[in-house]
């Protein structure tokens, strides 16, 4: 997150970190069910661990943390590169979470976002770009949903209805390492960090997010079919 600020503790209990050994964060994710996470399809890896209820990036033990293995990864069947449409994936945890103030799911919004909607994006991704500088604790950033026209103007021929753009002033954006993390609007999960320009936070180059309102049926049906 570029030019965000430290999230208040306990305010993002659905935020998950996907880790490679040894404790290397490579993507964010979101708890949407007691045993299921949502993340970006481009975050797919064969072997990884999941950390929930953790505030700092470092692997130091925190009393609220819960650790899991991802036992099943189900990318959306329509995910395609290089277009990056349908950039979402469900991850089944090896057991159900224990609900606490630090770990609980968030509902996926069934309403598509309108331009001007105020949202919050969070993650442990780099706070500088192209330099790499990872934060000590989870970062939060207020962003506003842009109209689909502004989104398409920023990225001609690259945007479809499975994506939406959001940003704030130049110099504020999600960035590398935030992928798969949540965009929360009006208390519901509206999007996932998908992609953006490089370096991050360039003027007139907003972040692009997976438009989850288009996928509520797929999410529900996939969880039911694999539970």
């Amino acid at each position: 997150i570029i030019n965000g600020s430290d999230c208040d503790m306990h305010t993002q209990p659905w935020q998950a970190a996907l880790l490679l050994r040894p404790n290397q964060l490579y993507c964010g994710a979101v708890l949407v069910h007691p045993q299921w996470l949502l993340t970006a399809a481009h975050c797919r890896k064969k072997v990884f661990r999941v950390r929930l209820g953790h505030y700092s990036l470092s692997p130091v033990y925190e009393s609220g943390q819960q650790m899991f293995q991802g036992v099943k990864s189900i990318p959306h069947p329509g995910y395609s590169h290089p277009g990056h449409s349908n950039d979402l994936m469900l991850i089944k945890l090896n057991r159900r979470i224990r609900p606490t103030k630090d770990v609980r799911p968030i509902n996926v919004s069934s309403h598509c976002p309108s331009a001007g909607t105020k949202c919050l994006v969070s993650g442990w991704g780099t706070t500088k770009s192209p330099q790499v500088h990872f934060p000590k604790v989870l970062q939060c950033l207020n962003i506003s949903v842009l109209s689909q026209k502004r989104c398409e103007d920023a990225y001609p021929r690259q945007i479809d209805d499975t994506m939406f753009c959001a940003g704030d002033k130049a110099g504020r954006d999600s960035c590398q390492g935030d992928s798969g993390g949540p965009v929360v609007c009006n208390g519901s999960l509206q999007g996932l960090v998908s992609w953006g320009d490089y370096p991050c936070a360039r003027p007139n180059r907003p972040g692009v997010y997976t438009n989850l309102c288009k996928f509520t049926k797929w999410i529900q049906e996939t969880i039911q079919a694999n539970s």
């Epitope: 290397q24 590398q176 953006g196 991050c200 692009v208």
Partner: antibody, heavy 127, light 108 residues
Framework: QLQLQESGPGLVKPSETLSLTCTVS??????????WVWIRQPPGKGLEWIGS???????YYSPSLKSRVTISVDTSKNQFSLKLSSVTAADTAVYYC???????????????????WGQGTTVTVSS | DIQMTQSPSSLSASVGDRVTITCRAS??????LNWYQQKPGKAPKLLIY???SLQSGVPSRFSGSGSGTDFTLTISSLQPEDFATYYC??????????FGGGTKVEIK
């Protein structure tokens, strides 16, 4: 201003291992989120990608060379290197190192263009 | 593997001419295409990235367009220093990164 400089032997015998180093000056190889790339160009021919290594030390190799190639980074020396084993005359080429600038973040981070190049070093494979 | 086909392989043009070089990918690569210029005995130089974005320091007479499988590099008014070989390059999610065969722009 970032500069890249290739170094290594100009002559390698068939079946031996070609070893080249790229020294990065004017910037830190470990501070920025770039790819570090090796490319070669046989005499009178076009450009051929050999492989790349990223900020996280993940390597990506050309399938046609994968069994013979190793790319590594030495952050303490601000260098990255290429090893190509079991060389033949077909490996004779100008070898370039380059920096790969990602075209985006997230899903776009795997795509890049080479925005800074070394001047190239000629390697001849001959007995 | 994605194949990149450049055309023509060579062309002759005069100073001031408008020159167009095309590059075709064997499957869609969205806008992930870059263009390079290479002069004899020198390393390639990045001109255009992401199909249409001009690399810093490159003259505005160079422009790129296209998306999907068909791409174009245009030099609006050829200058003496533009006589060189031009390569397109795609950078895929999975290797290999591949270049086109090159287009040599010669003096008529």
């Amino acid at each position: 201003q970032l500069q890249l400089q290739e170094s290594g032997p100009g002559l390698v015998k068939p079946s031996e291992t070609l070893s080249l180093t790229c020294t990065v000056s004017g910037g830190s190889i470990s501070s920025d989120d770039y790819y570090w790339v090796w490319i070669r160009q046989p005499p009178g021919k076009g450009l051929e990608w050999i492989g790349s290594i990223d900020y996280y030390a993940s390597t990506y190799y050309s399938p046609s060379l994968k069994s013979r190639v190793t790319i590594s980074v030495d952050t303490s020396k601000n260098q990255f290197s290429l090893k190509l084993s079991s060389v033949t005359a077909a490996d004779t080429a100008v070898y370039y190192c380059a920096r790969g600038r990602p075209l985006g973040y997230g899903a776009k981070h795997y795509y890049y263009g080479m925005d800074v190049w070394g001047q190239g070093t000629t390697v001849t494979v001959s007995s | 593997d994605i194949q990149m086909t450049q055309s023509p392989s060579s062309l002759s043009a005069s100073v001031g001419d408008r020159v167009t070089i095309t590059c075709r990918a064997s499957q869609s690569i969205s806008s992930y295409l870059n263009w390079y210029q290479q002069k004899p005995g020198k390393a390639p130089k990045l001109l255009i990235y992401s199909a249409s974005s001009l690399q810093s320091g490159v003259p505005s007479r160079f422009s790129g367009s296209g998306s999907g499988t068909d791409f174009t590099l245009t030099i609006s008014s050829l200058q003496p220093e533009d006589f060189a070989t031009y390569y397109c390059q795609q950078s895929p999610y999975f290797p290999p990164l591949t270049f086109g065969g090159g287009t040599k722009v010669e003096i008529k």
